[in-house]
């Protein structure tokens, strides 16, 4: 509450997160022209990345382009990219949508379609839909421990969200355990009125807001966090503005003296922890 | 403008960036003692790294030290590092400028120079200049889409910089399209009065400031972002304070039962997105 | 000091860090059943990761699980995980503490113990203590250069912590050189009343606070930073809340057409640079 007589000061915050959980992933894997069912286990080292304190990322879906090598190949025949003769292909041209630089030749992509030849990582990435349902949809059951240390330097006051009395096997619940700082990812989405299974396909950004409204006067001292959750990406976003949340990364290796890479397009949830609030003292 | 009767509140912000573009890189590559012209294509997975929302990095230049292995070798003969006898070399000594620990022996670096032998990743990194012009100088034509979601919790107000009416094929321009949130990297530098081609050699830090001055009163509601750009690193910085922006990272692999690495010294532009402003309401 | 007549504005900040130092690591290495002393050199590319400006991480300790492959194996026999018959093992069950999914069979872990068989990255990670003393305990002697650019947009004022007059071979000292922005990691801990050698074992989070109290009036202009240090993680934290600071990451490779990984549990110090303060002007 606004006590006008108080000297108010914004919070200085540091956050540390720890995600727990394993996912079982079943997908079709093609090897040597044969497609078979692949089954694998993903643990934290496979689906999350060492990020800063205020954000963490959980991969919920992916598309792999394996064994790419720098060479010439036909570009992917997305809308408007097909050609019938070399005239349609401009040597040296880089189409922002494409993944390479045109050589000027129009070449067969498959039995029925021709596209401009490009110098690129080949074969170029297929612009296919993210798998549905999401491959790591079971990430809904992962948990995250959030540790938050706060400081009001002007008031020389420091505290943290985890108190010695807390129980490390708790799970946050708005009513039954609002001070527990271990959150089930699915619960975060439910609290924010979002469907985890749906968002997991394309990815998204979820805000975890930690609000500290601290009264530091000794006679009415109060300083505990309040957690709330809201989706930060725009679920109604136009295609052209890249809906969801994904990024590409590569694993490089050498085979037969040629550098190759596996390109991974990782879809997932980026959780942003937004800490705010004030400390007031007479 | 400062409306003194209003209750002002600082902005809570979340940012998501997406870089687009490909670069054609031509450089001399030495293999088996033979130097030939190498040509390669870099796409987002090659030149950028999955970073947090408030920053993104675009590699514009690099120096590679390939096939390093943990062994003994002469250290690089930088200024003041040469020796003529073992007396000049101290066993166990770690020179902060050097990349290894001295064995105490003075050994030939090449036909004319001798340096102290070190236990290190060998051969040690040559302290050579960053290539000029920068290898990925064409990054000037890359574009970045910036999505910014803001919140004034006290006023229970949320908005974002991208509106449904916006066109995903726009490019930001201070006069013609100041609300477009797709920025050409070269334009950002031009707006900040900087030369991209020059900065790309050594790297640098560029600030993209997003200022929200929001009047949340219903009768004169206004809440749109204003973008401005300024260089954050000191271009006149003394050598000893490490001018530009670079970092080293390694790719590890095994060959002949020995762990090897390729060391990459990556120069580039780190873009920091600095969101600030207030929401005021009667 | 609080000048009530001044218009106060919070600081907008950008940070760039550069760590220097090499560590000599000696540890027992087992290869082909033979244990011998391993000795290696770690430089910045080995112990630090390209992170955002406001944080940097220095690895001080690690535990490796080499040559893991996706298959079936007995889970690690931690407290309460042993079994005597298949009844104790539930097919499809994922214990949050475990690293895999149970098959429903109880199998020998070693000559004396049996545990539930899991589908996982095998052999599963041994839950062994972090090495003591820490493998990279010499990181105490590493140094970090911190560059901080600040801006008060309302006052149109920009400055930085490194001035042209500064000497790049200085080291911060609270009394003798309080404006030097090159910090020895061990000194940071000493200033914060912490023992580096101790914290290096399990890891921790250290705050470097940069306080700018700026008087921007021309007649009494003052705007220089003040540095202070405090530990941000809770050293008295209960086991269940994951004390210290560590994360797992993996290096993937292929051998004999099977994907393998080396899992590294990296312990270390995350340094958070917390910049705050105000600019006041009449």
């Amino acid at each position: 509450s606004d006590k006008l007589y108080q000297r108010k000061e914004p919070v200085i915050s540091s956050v540390h997160t720890k995600v727990k959980g394993i996912a079982e992933v079943t997908e079709n894997v093609t090897e040597g022209g044969v497609t078979k069912l692949g089954h694998s286990i993903f643990d934290t080292a496979d689906y999350t990345f060492p990020l800063q304190g205020n954000s963490f990322f959980v991969m919920t879906n992916y598309v792999k382009s394996e064994g790419q090598v720098q060479t010439l190949c036909p570009e992917y025949p997305r809308r408007g990219a097909q050609c019938s003769s070399d005239r349609r292909c401009k040597k040296g041209w880089m189409d922002p949508q494409s993944k390479g630089i045109q050589t000027g030749r129009c070449v067969p992509y498959d039995k029925t379609r021709k596209t401009c030849e490009v110098s690129a990582w080949c074969p170029t990435e297929e612009e296919k839909e993210a798998p549905r349902p999401a491959l790591l949809r079971s990430a809904e059951n992962f948990t995250v421990l959030i540790k938050n240390n706060i400081h009001f330097p002007g008031h020389n006051y420091t505290t943290r969200n985890i108190l010695p009395t807390m129980n490390g096997s708790c799970t946050f619940h708005k009513t039954w355990d609002p001070q527990c700082s271990i959150f089930r990812l699915g619960d975060i989405f439910q609290e924010a009125g979002e469907n985890f299974t749906e968002v997991a396909v394309q990815g998204g950004i979820m805000g975890i807001e930690i609000y500290w409204d601290c009264n530091l006067d000794s006679w009415s001292h109060h300083c505990r966090p309040r957690y709330s959750f809201r989706r930060l990406d725009d679920k109604n976003m136009d295609e052209s503005f890249v809906p969801g949340y994904n990024f590409r990364y590569a694993k490089y290796y050498k085979e037969n003296n040629v550098e190759k890479r596996t390109l991974i397009k990782a879809f997932g949830i980026r959780f942003d922890i937004l800490v705010f609030g004030t400390g007031g003292k007479f | 403008s400062d409306k003194l009767y209003q209750r002002k509140e600082p902005v809570i912000s979340s940012v998501h960036t997406k870089v687009k573009g490909i670069a054609e890189v031509t450089e001399n590559v030495t293999e088996g003692g033979v130097t030939k012209l190498g040509h390669s294509i870099f796409d987002t997975a090659d030149y950028t790294f999955p970073l947090q929302g408030n920053s993104f990095f675009v590699m514009t230049n690099y120096v590679k030290s390939e096939g390093q292995v943990q062994t003994l070798c002469p250290e690089y003969p930088r200024r003041g590092a040469q020796c003529s006898s073992d007396r000049r070399c101290k066993k166990g000594w770690m020179d902060p400028q050097s990349k290894g620990i001295q064995t105490g022996r003075c050994v030939p670096y090449d036909k004319t120079r001798k340096t102290c032998e070190v236990s290190a990743w060998c051969p040690t990194e040559e302290e050579k200049e960053a290539p000029r012009p920068a290898l990925l100088r064409s990054a000037e034509n890359f574009t970045v889409l910036i999505k910014n979601n803001i919140h004034f919790p006290g006023h229970n107000y949320t908005t974002r910089n991208i509106l449904p009416t916006m066109n995903g094929s726009c490019t930001f321009h201070k006069t013609w399209d100041p609300q477009c949130s797709i920025f050409r990297l070269g334009d950002i530098f031009q707006e900040a009065g900087e030369n991209f081609t020059e900065v790309a050699v050594q790297g640098g830090i560029m600030g993209i400031e997003i200022y929200w001055d929001c009047n949340l009163d219903s009768w004169s509601h206004h809440c749109r972002p204003r973008y401005s750009f300024r260089r954050l690193d000191d271009k006149n910085m003394d050598e000893s304070f490490v001018p530009g922006y670079n970092f080293r990272y390694a790719k590890y692999y095994k060959e002949n039962n020995v762990e090897k690495r390729t060391l990459i010294k990556a120069f580039g532009i780190r873009f920091d997105i600095l969101v600030f402003g207030t929401g005021g309401k009667f | 000091s609080d000048k009530l007549y001044q218009r106060k504005e919070p600081v907008i900040s950008s940070v760039h860090t550069k760590v220097k130092g090499i560590a000599e690591v000696t540890e027992n290495v087992t290869e082909g059943g033979v244990t011998k002393l391993g000795h290696s050199i770690f430089d910045t590319a080995d112990y630090t990761f390209p992170l955002q400006g406001n944080s940097f991480f220095v690895m001080t300790n690690y535990v490796k699980s080499e040559g893991q492959v996706q298959t079936l194996c007995p889970e690690y026999p931690r407290r309460g995980a042993q079994c005597s018959s298949d009844r104790r093992c539930k097919k499809g069950w994922m214990d949050p503490q475990s690293k895999g999914i149970q098959t429903g069979r109880c199998v020998p872990y070693d000559k004396t113990r049996k545990t539930c068989e899991v589908s996982a990255w095998c052999p599963t990670e041994e839950e062994k203590e972090a090495p003591r003393p820490a493998l990279l305990r010499s990181a105490e002697n590493f140094t970090v250069l911190i560059k901080n650019n600040i801006h008060f947009p309302g006052h149109n004022y920009t400055t930085r912590n490194i001035l042209p007059t500064m000497n790049g071979s200085c080291t911060f000292h609270k009394t003798w050189d309080p404006q030097c922005s090159i910090f020895r990691l061990g000194d940071i801990f000493q200033e914060a009343g912490e023992n580096f050698t101790e914290v290096a074992v399990q890891g921790g989070i250290m705050g470097i606070e940069i306080y700018w109290d700026c008087n921007l009036d021309s007649w009494s202009h003052h705007c220089r930073p003040r540095y202070s240090f405090r530990r941000l993680d809770d050293k008295n934290m209960d086991e269940s809340f994951v004390p210290g600071y560590n994360f797992r990451y993996a290096k993937y490779y292929k051998e004999n057409n099977v994907e393998k990984r080396t899992l590294i549990k990296a312990f270390g110090i995350r340094f958070d640079i917390l910049v705050f303060g105000t600019g006041g002007k009449f």
Epitope: - | G67, V69, T71, L72, R105, S119, C122, K260 | -
Partner: nanobody, 120 residues
Amino acid sequence: EVQLVESGGGLVKPGGSLRLSCAASGSFFRVNNMAWYRQGPGKQRELVADITRGDRTNYADSVNGRFTISRDNVRNTVYLQMNGLKPEDTAVYYCYATIELGVLEPRDYWGQGTQVTVSS
């Protein structure tokens, strides 16, 4: 005690091939650079080829393209494959290695030498 033991020398006709081996034995921490030198009748000892622990190679101009140096880091062995041998390759071939007995305790070791004779 650390030793370098060579093998593979002998008599061969011009245009023929030989493969020399040299193995490091004993107790030590690490084998670093390895090399082959030779000393022809009435000549000074000269470098033939060397190889780093990271498999980088360097050859004398006179043997470049004919000789190949390689190493096996499991067996701590260096090899010299000699093809297109000429009479002027006749010499005693010595193995050389920089070996760390303990950490930061490098010593240079030589083998006893193996005779290679190229003659018709």
